[in-house]
């Protein structure tokens, strides 16, 4: 029974179970394509266990391979909107430190009003993830339509 | 070698590895938008390790943060069908106990015939997840086109 | 503190943390619908920890339940391209051994230019996963647009 006892005695963070699920707070000013996120039990079903928010962007606290997932739905959208709107693209990437800047995940909203995807990627302590929404349209702030999260998978 | 031995001796369920992957059984009667699921090795590649089915709906047995994922494909569908029958929407939520009722994940089929997404969410023992498909179109029962699952991630 | 020490001493592979994230290498010759993958730190952010590549196809090394995920974006694509070249379909399945051949995940590109999905599925040591892209359109090789991965979840 030793393992179960040890597992209970150690803080979960030491097991490397870093995880976060965020909801949209707001979009940036016009020249800033970033989405700004928020999380915490007071806000509903969003949370941060390990990672932190830095001015609405997600900062990683533990090295490892992470599953990154996102869903973004456009606020006012029908199939006719989607087919005629300004090219709208979502990209998730490491935006700081600048030396590690890279796009991890990119999707366009062609004739749809929602994009959703996920991927495994190595992240390092201090990496900040940014989600850039290019185009003129607003994302929905409904918590079941737009969300962003990470899950530590292994060292 | 103590850790590996201890891990093997303990039942997997005690490690909190609850997981389920379900295939579509049938849709509900006309006024019931719920999809009814089934799972088990006899049915193919679906399974339940921890969670249970209650009248075709998934009931959680262990508190924790879960990764919930779903894919639903419409059965007889082209992009024109999908746009003509708009709105067809899928919502995954906690439907009981009523006090915890909430929509966790919502997607519309606009001009597409498949939706797929995933999210992290806290679930409690006894929570029952329902998947509501609104609209007149029928979902495919092909096991590689329509499926629904959960994976326990951490306490 | 015994658990943490034991965890550090054991090789990660013995914990069952098999994981892989691949990037597209190339498509097959005309009669071969398979996508050919590559992975490794020298290529960027792709990696294989446990599973292996066999002629561009992913081979599983450990029995268990896996989360399989994929995103494929068509290379030169607009919503009109996608609808004109319909049907373009992606299927992920076990292609060998032949006795276990089965389609695990299937999606069509109706009016969209990207598909993304994920599912839980049991896989056995020696299973080789193939990703078949049917249709005339080419997939993007950008590493943030097209990727394929697996993550061991539990025995």
């Amino acid at each position: 029974q030793r393992f179960a006892q040890a597992q209970q005695q150690l803080p979960l963070e030491s097991l490397g179970w870093d995880v976060a699920e965020l909801q949209l707070n707001h979009t940036g000013p016009q020249q800033d394509p970033r989405l700004y996120w928020q999380g915490g039990p007071a806000l509903g079903r969003s949370f941060l266990h390990g990672p932190e928010l830095d001015k609405g962007q997600l900062r990683i606290h533990r090295d490892g391979i992470y599953m990154v997932h996102i869903q973004v739905t456009l606020a006012i959208c029908s199939s006719t909107t989607a087919s005629r709107h300004h090219p709208t693209t979502l990209a998730v990437g490491i935006c700081s430190p600048a030396s590690r800047s890279i796009s991890l995940l990119r999707l366009s909203f062609h004739q749809g009003c929602t994009i959703a995807s996920q991927r495994l990627t190595p992240l390092a302590r201090g990496d900040t993830l940014c989600t850039n929404l290019t185009g003129t349209l607003l994302p929905s702030r409904n918590t079941d339509e737009t969300f962003f999260g990470v899950q530590w998978v292994r060292p | 070698q103590r850790f590996a031995q201890a891990q093997q001796q303990l039942p997997l369920e005690s490690l909190g590895w609850d997981v389920a992957e379900l295939q579509l059984n049938h849709t509900g009667p006309q006024q019931d938008p719920r999809l009814y699921w089934q799972g088990g090795p006899a049915l193919g590649r679906s399974f339940l390790h921890g969670p249970e089915l209650d009248k075709g709906q998934l009931r959680i047995h262990r508190d924790g943060i879960y990764m919930v994922h779903i894919q639903v494909t419409l059965a007889i569908c082209s992009s024109t069908t999908a746009s003509r029958h708009h709105p067809t929407t899928l919502a995954v939520g906690i439907c009981s106990p009523a006090s915890r009722s909430i929509s966790l994940l919502r997607l519309s089929f606009h001009q597409g015939c498949t939706i797929a997404s995933q999210r992290l969410t806290p679930l409690a023992r006894g929570d029952t997840l329902c998947t509501n498909l609104t609209g007149t179109l029928l979902p495919s029962r092909n096991t590689d086109e329509t499926f629904f699952g959960v994976q326990w991630v951490r306490p | 503190q015994r658990f943490a020490q034991a965890q550090q001493q054991l090789p990660l592979e013995s914990l069952g943390w098999d994981v892989a994230e691949l990037q597209l290498n190339h498509t097959g010759p005309q009669q071969d619908p398979r996508l050919y993958w590559q992975g490794g730190p020298a290529l960027g952010r792709s990696f294989l920890h446990g599973p292996e590549l066999d002629k561009g196809q992913l081979r599983i090394h450990r029995d268990g339940i896996y989360m399989v995920h994929i995103q494929v974006t068509l290379a030169i694509c607009s919503s009109t391209t996608a609808s004109r070249h319909h049907p373009t379909t992606l299927a992920v399945g076990i292609c060998s051994p032949a006795s276990r051949s089965i389609s695990l995940l299937r999606l069509s590109f109706h009016q969209g230019c990207t598909i993304a999905s994920q599912r839980l599925t049991p896989l056995a040591r020696g299973d080789t996963l193939c990703t078949n892209l049917t249709g005339t359109l080419l997939p993007s090789r950008n590493t943030d647009e097209t990727f394929f991965g697996v993550q061991w979840v539990r025995p």
């Epitope: 606020a75 005629r84 003129t136 607003l138 929905s140 | - | 607009s78």
Partner: antibody, heavy 119, light 115 residues
Framework: QLQVVESGGGLMQPGGSLRLSCAAS????????MSWVRQAPGKGLEWVSS????????YYADSVKSRFTISTDNAKNTLYLQMNSLKPDDTAVYYC????????????WGQGTQVTVSS | QAVLTQPPSLSASPGSSVRLTCTLN?????????ISWYQQKAGSPPRYLLY?????????GSGVPSRFSGSTDASANAGLLLISGLQPEDEADYYC?????????FGGGTKLTVL
């Protein structure tokens, strides 16, 4: 067919308050973009404020920020503009404009309601 | 903040074609905005004409004749409204609007006179 009808205009003194209403029909109100646009006598159109989808977003022109508040009552399919600390410069015809599926456009316009601010 | 400049007035003969311009200030790119056009006749509310981003991404207002079309001139950083086969009833004020992420801006308007 999208239709909007404004009401609530009138003559007000500087510093006063007024609430404009806009009754909408022919579309799903809660999933739409609703706006107020004004036109001063002999002048061009000026965007005032917009509210988007389930009241999740509200935006204002700099000229009215902190003085005007846009809101909706989805049950009544009605848009409101609460105007406080009115100035003579706010004198204009106020139009309600709606778009049911594209936030960047003013697809359907009302006839307008006159607001005059004068001592 | 985006600023849209339109020529105050323009006149043309019936049957001719006319091009109305809507120039965005240099700090902003026309490609970053949704440009739409509105017609307002004396004593009436404005009417939505069209939206144009590209040939494949455009929208014509309900009941708006195909004589009205949109375009952009990237080199001039401008949106364009093209009216062909000009008719007397086209005499009106024409306004362009630029939209991005919640905020709208109107141009000053062009008074089109059909001689």
């Amino acid at each position: 067919q999208l239709q909007v009808v404004e009401s609530g205009g009138g003559l007000m003194q500087p510093g006063g308050s007024l609430r404009l209403s806009c009754a909408a029909s022919g579309f799903t109100f809660s999933g739409s973009a609703m706006s107020w646009v004004r036109q001063a006598p002999g002048k061009g159109l000026e965007w005032v404020s917009s509210i988007y989808s389930h009241s999740m977003y509200t935006y204002y022109a700099d000229s009215v920020k902190s003085r005007f508040t846009i809101s909706t009552d989805n049950a009544k399919n009605t848009l409101y503009l609460q105007m406080n600390s009115l100035k003579p410069d706010d004198t204009a015809v106020y139009y309600c404009a709606a778009s049911s599926d594209y936030e960047g456009l003013f697809v359907s316009w009302g006839q307008g309601t006159q607001v005059t601010v004068s001592s | 903040q985006a600023v849209l400049t339109q020529p105050p007035s323009l006149s043309a003969s019936p049957g001719s074609s006319v091009r109305l311009t809507c120039t965005l200030n240099s700090a902003n790119s026309v490609g970053s905005y949704d440009i739409s056009w509105y017609q307002q006749k004396a004593g009436s509310p404005p009417r939505y004409l069209l939206y144009y981003y590209s040939d494949s991404l455009s929208h014509q207002g309900s009941g708006v004749p195909s004589r009205f079309s949109g375009s952009t001139d990237a080199s001039a950083n401008a949106g364009l409204l093209l009216i062909s086969g000009l008719q007397p009833e086209d005499e009106a004020d024409y306004y362009c609007s630029a939209y991005n992420r919640g905020s709208h801006v109107f141009g000053g308007g062009t008074k089109l006179t059909v001689l």
